[in-house]
């Protein structure tokens, strides 16, 4: 329908990242109407041909999407009314990473905003004490990361040391032969501290600490994608 | 920077071949849609062919369909045309140019003259 | 194909002259209508995508409305760097023609 002479609407996204393999969301949100008939929406890539995902008349309208997309997008139908424009992206891929616009047309008028889409690997890592080494060690380990990652070891009675010196990192390739597992090992640890092994690339940081006592050892971890306001 | 260098041009006989290449620099090749557009000398512009990023879907305007093959070398970061059967009215300035959102084209290269004459 | 029609095919006008040009699809092509301005021996340059979607660097005084079959163009105060070519092209299915242009001259 034409929309000549109608106001723009406020369309909001928030840059994210996507976790190789599996599935993401890229968000988009808009001033919703009173009539999901009355609304479209259409999700672009830069540099893509074709859409990335097209819904009007409350169902999906996918003649125009892109090779590269197909069988891979939904939108989420029933939070359509409400103004959600949220894609799903099903099995994300390295080459998904790129700016995304996600236009929007409804009674009210029409509007667009860009998205920072990354794609990468990022995971958990886990502490534990390595009970096979001949000294106190730890052995931190990630199953899944790209690009490489820094590993940097920290201690909370250490505060501010460099342990580079007595801790080895090692990449190994996985089988799909883009993610790497991660493996970091901590030589001459002392009990009664608590450690932390930190991994970071450019789309996410991740800490796995430990605590190492006589009588029990505590583990926790927790994982941040950075440059997403999400 | 982007940049865009075509080359490859000259002149060539009627029912001669030539293939044209499209240096790539400043952005990740392989994400973007390339096209070529050319221009008849004190004409308009006509859009050519266009090819996906990954180089499996390719386009082509009916006036160079079974003559004209686009194709990319992503590893080399160049676009390709390869002109068979020239004819008269396929002088023009060849540019090749980028997809920026759909076919929209930005930036575009400088352009290369082909001169089919005999 | 989807035929694109431009008017006029030349215009003459004055600095600071508010001008306009019309493009027209022979089909709806929603708002997937690119605008571009060519001066003599350069290559083109995109103003304008999605029918009014301006471009990264390109001035103000340039604006695009339309959607459907009928398109405008408008510069609001023509500049001394303003006098080109102008050309439209639909964007939503291949082949992806052009308009034949519009060559906007000093008076």
């Known amino acids: 329908f034409g929309i000549s002479g109608r106001h723009s609407i406020t369309v909001t996204t928030v840059a994210s990242a996507g976790n190789i393999g599996e599935d993401g969301i890229l968000s988009c949100t808009f001033e919703p109407d009173i009539k999901l008939s009355d609304i479209v929406i259409q999700w672009l890539k830069e540099g893509v041909l074709g859409l990335v995902h097209e819904f009007k008349e409350g169902k999906d309208e996918l003649s125009e999407q892109d090779e590269m997309f197909r069988g891979r997008t939904a939108v989420f139908a029933d939070q359509v009314i409400v103004g959600n424009a949220s894609l799903r992206l099903k099995n994300v891929q390295l080459t998904d990473a790129g700016t995304y616009k996600c236009y929007i047309i409804t009674s009210k008028g029409k509007g667009n905003a860009n998205l920072e889409y990354k794609t990468g690997a990022f995971s958990m890592p886990e502490v534990n004490v390595d009970y096979n080494a001949s000294s106190e060690t730890l052995r931190c380990e990630a199953p899944r990361w790209f690009p490489q990652p820094t590993v940097v070891w920290a201690s909370q009675v250490d505060q501010g040391a460099n342990f580079s010196e007595v801790s080895n990192t090692s990449f190994e390739l996985n089988s799909e032969n883009v993610t790497m597992k991660v493996v970091s090992v901590l030589y001459n640890v002392t009990i009664n501290n608590t450690y932390s092994c930190m991994i970071e690339n450019d789309i996410a940081k991740a800490t796995g600490d430990i605590k190492v006592t006589e009588s029990e050892i505590k583990r926790r971890s927790h994982l941040q994608l950075l440059n997403s306001k999400a | 920077e982007v940049q865009l260098l075509e080359s490859g041009g000259g002149l060539v006989q009627p029912g001669g071949s030539l293939r044209l290449s499209c240096a790539a620099s400043g952005f990740t090749f392989s994400s973007y849609g390339m096209h070529w557009v050319r221009q008849a000398p004190g004409k308009g512009l006509e859009w050519v062919s266009g090819?996906?990023?990954?180089?499996?879907?390719?386009y082509y305007a009916d006036s160079v369909k079974g003559r004209f093959t686009i194709s990319r070398d992503n590893s080399k970061n160049t676009l390709y045309l390869q002109m068979n059967s020239l004819r008269a009215e396929d002088t023009a300035v060849y540019y090749c140019?980028?997809?920026?959102?759909?076919?929209?084209?930005?930036?575009w290269g400088q352009g290369t003259l082909v001169n089919v004459s005999s | 194909d989807i035929q694109m029609t431009q008017s006029p095919s030349s215009l003459s006008a004055s600095v600071g002259d508010r001008v306009t040009i019309t493009c027209r699809a022979s089909?709806?092509?929603?708002?997937?209508l690119a605008w571009y301005q060519q001066k003599p021996g350069k290559a083109p340059k995109l103003l304008i995508y999605g029918a009014s979607t301006l471009q990264s660097g390109v001035p103000s005084r340039f604006s695009g409305s339309g959607s459907g079959t009928d398109f405008t163009l408008t510069i609001s105060s023509l500049q001394p760097e303003d006098f080109a070519t102008y050309y439209c092209q639909q964007t939503t299915m291949s082949p992806y023609t052009f308009g034949q242009g519009t060559k906007v001259e000093i008076k």
């Open positions: 090819i996906s990023g990954s180089g499996g879907s390719t």
């Open positions: 089909q709806d092509i929603s708002y997937w």
């Open positions: 140019a980028r997809t920026q959102w759909r076919a929209s084209l930005d930036p």
